[in-house]
């Protein structure tokens, strides 16, 4: 039975040209996390596998950095980065848990909601 829950940074905003950390956290389960996928609806950004380490999709290599932890750092943000991001936790024995983050990339310094996850 799947008892865990995914906590995410929720809806966040950041400034164009800046950076943001996407974070998910799996709680309320003793299941072992064996892989985490970071995705958009139609493309894979990165995978962190317990045995194989991190893999960053070539199309994002220049702008995506692994971590901190199982999170993902997006750099040099553009307005086109606005949208939904998903963390998919592969666990044993529970199966998969998914969290959703909505990122809004703003043109000016209107970003405020996601400030504590923003990298200076």
């Amino acid at each position: 039975m799947m008892t865990g829950t995914i906590e995410t940074t929720g809806n966040i905003s950041a400034e164009k040209g800046g950076s943001i950390i996407l974070q998910c956290h799996l709680s309320s389960t003793t299941a072992q996390v064996t892989q985490v996928n970071w995705e958009q609806q139609d493309q894979l950004l990165a995978i962190c596998n317990a045995d194989l380490g991190w893999h960053i999709s070539p199309s994002f290599k220049d702008r995506v950095a692994p971590g901190p932890g199982l999170g993902l750092t997006l750099q040099s943000l553009t307005v086109n980065d606005t949208g939904e991001y998903f963390c998919i936790y592969h666990t044993y024995p529970d199966g998969t848990y998914t969290g959703r983050i909505f990122l809004e990339v703003l043109e000016s310094s209107v970003a405020e909601h996601g400030a504590r996850f923003q990298i200076p």
Epitope: Q35, N37, E39, Q41, D42, Q43, L44, I47, N49, L52, H55, S57, S59, F86, I88, H90, T96, T98
Partner: antibody, heavy 118, light 107 residues
């Protein structure tokens, strides 16, 4: 549980437009996930055609992009496929399927055979 | 597009046999591969995702492994209901693409 059911004409004439509908029960197509069309010519492999997401965004296979349109009718909890300028090569079993975030397909309709012939 | 090349295209085996199918991707897809079983006149059924994770309710005799470009799907002890066609699929980038299939027949 979630069920998908394809419907539409089984025979389409060459150069015409193929139209199919997928009716989803047990889940609202506006709640989550991406809703896909995948086809399989007789005796051959599978080809992903495209999807419409729960938010209404679409993504198509570039090999078909100029001919394919996927839309939805949220009031009927249905999504549809239109494929224009069909030829005999478009004869296939057409499946609708729900995609999981990771790009795999856990839930499929039973498929419907569409034959393109005059 | 990423090409997925399966081998063999068909194979004969007996109940109780261990069977292995391989799939090679035309580029590195890390662990983003799924495996499906399809019986005649039926829709494909998801067995394995992310190279090695069994989908809900899939028996433990089915397993997957591999990363990068080379992937393996194994049935440890064939059961009568396992005779079918098996497909790999890359879930790394759109357009999502499938292998050409491996038809598993009774010897």
């Amino acid at each position: 549980q979630v069920q998908l059911q394809e419907s539409g004409p089984g025979l389409v004439k060459p150069s015409q437009t193929l139209s199919l509908t997928c009716t989803v029960s047990g889940y609202s197509i506006t709640d989550d996930y991406a809703w896909n069309w995948i086809r399989q010519p007789p005796g051959k492999g599978l080809e992903w055609m495209g999807y419409i997401s729960y938010s209404g965004n679409t993504m198509y296979n570039p090999s078909l992009k100029s001919r394919v349109t996927i839309s939805r009718d949220t009031s009927k909890n249905q999504f549809s496929l239109k494929l224009s300028s069909v030829t005999a090569a478009d004869t296939a079993v057409y499946y609708c399927a729900r995609k999981y975030y990771g790009g795999w397909f856990p839930i499929w309709g039973q498929g419907t055979l569409v034959t393109v012939s005059s | 597009d990423i090409q997925m090349t399966q081998s063999p295209s068909s194979l004969s085996a007996s109940v109780g046999d261990r069977v292995t199918i391989t799939c090679k991707a035309s580029q590195d897809v890390f662990t983003a591969v799924a495996w499906y079983q399809q019986k005649p006149g039926k829709a494909p059924k998801l067995l394995i995702y992310s190279a090695s994770y069994r989908h809900t309710g899939v028996p433990s005799r089915f397993s997957g492994s591999g990363s990068g470009t080379d992937f393996t799907f194994t049935i440890s002890s064939l059961q009568p209901e396992d005779f079918a066609t098996y497909y790999c699929q890359q879930s790394y980038s759109t357009p999502w693409t499938f292998g050409q299939g491996t038809r598993l027949e009774i010897k």
